[in-house]
């Protein structure tokens, strides 16, 4: 999977608009590794 | 409202260095990497590197080979860079970008820094 | 680096119509390409994220298609404020790269 900053906050966004934003406030892109997807 | 405001435009000698600073507004800094480009006359756009404003990481084009130096004030939410040993070849508009998610998702964009090099 | 190929470099194109521009990518990217417009003496303005994924504010006359190496930005009717330069970019590897830029003007 790609790991650049760029594909992360994406992947991020469409995570959280999965899951309706309810997710912690601090799962953020610049704090979560690739292992967290 | 987001807004990535840099500094003003420079002139410089070749040989010097120079620091360019992108002011973030608007949203939270540290939350997400800021990207540096530059566009030559001219020239296609060329990405400089990024930054984690969290952990101060950094990722660079090897393009630039160590002339190029990314930092943060996360107090100020300010990203800065800084290039050194100037050449002629350096005359661009730099920006800063950054891809936010929240509070709205899109790719922002600091209104750019003109840098010339000339003796 | 990874080498994105945009075309053509230039164009002229009437309103209404409909205007493709095309960029190739020396190895695959998968769909992680982003399309901008960037207007004379401007910052660039984002259009399309993962290949085909429009920005919220941008104008569904604009999309984007592809995956791989062949990537494709449409303007479905062209309008008078769409005279700019479009530029792909990958992000699927660092270095990012950007594409040469395509320069749009209205016949």
């Known amino acids: 999977a790609c790991d650049t900053a760029t594909c992360v906050t994406h992947r991020l966004a469409g995570l959280l608009s999965r899951s309706g934003g309810v997710v912690k406030n601090n799962f953020v892109p610049t704090n979560v590794g690739s292992k967290a997807f | 409202e987001v807004q990535l405001v840099q500094s003003g435009a420079e002139v410089k000698k070749p040989g010097a260095s120079v620091k360019v600073s992108c002011k973030a507004s608007g949203y939270t800094f540290t939350d997400y990497y800021m990207n540096w480009v530059r566009q030559a006359p001219g020239q296609r756009l060329e990405w400089m590197g990024v930054?984690?404003?969290?952990?101060?990481?950094?990722t660079y084009n090897r393009k630039f080979k160590g002339r190029v130096t990314i930092t943060v004030d996360k107090s100020a939410s300010t990203a800065y860079m800084e290039l050194s040993s100037l050449r002629s070849e350096d005359t661009a508009v730099y920006y800063c970008?950054?891809?936010?998610?929240?509070?709205?998702?899109?790719?922002?964009w600091g209104q750019g820094t003109t840098v010339t090099v000339s003796s | 680096d990874i080498q994105m190929t945009q075309s053509p470099s230039s164009l002229s194109a009437s309103v209404g119509d409909r205007v493709t521009i095309t960029c190739k990518a020396s190895q695959n990217v998968g769909t992680n390409v982003a399309w901008y417009q960037q207007k004379p003496g401007k910052s660039p303005k984002a259009l399309i994220y993962s290949a085909s994924y429009r920005y919220s504010g941008v104008p569904s006359r604009f999309s984007g298609s592809g995956s791989g190496t062949d990537f494709t930005l449409t303007i479905s009717s062209l309008q008078p404020e769409d005279v700019a330069t479009y530029h792909c970019?990958?992000?699927?590897?660092?270095?990012?790269?950007f594409g040469q830029g395509t320069k749009l003007e209205i016949k």
């Open positions: 970008a950054s891809l936010l998610i929240r509070p709205h998702y899109f790719d922002y």
């Open positions: 970019q990958q992000y699927n590897f660092y270095p990012y790269t």
């Open positions: 930054i984690n404003p969290y952990n101060v990481r950094t």
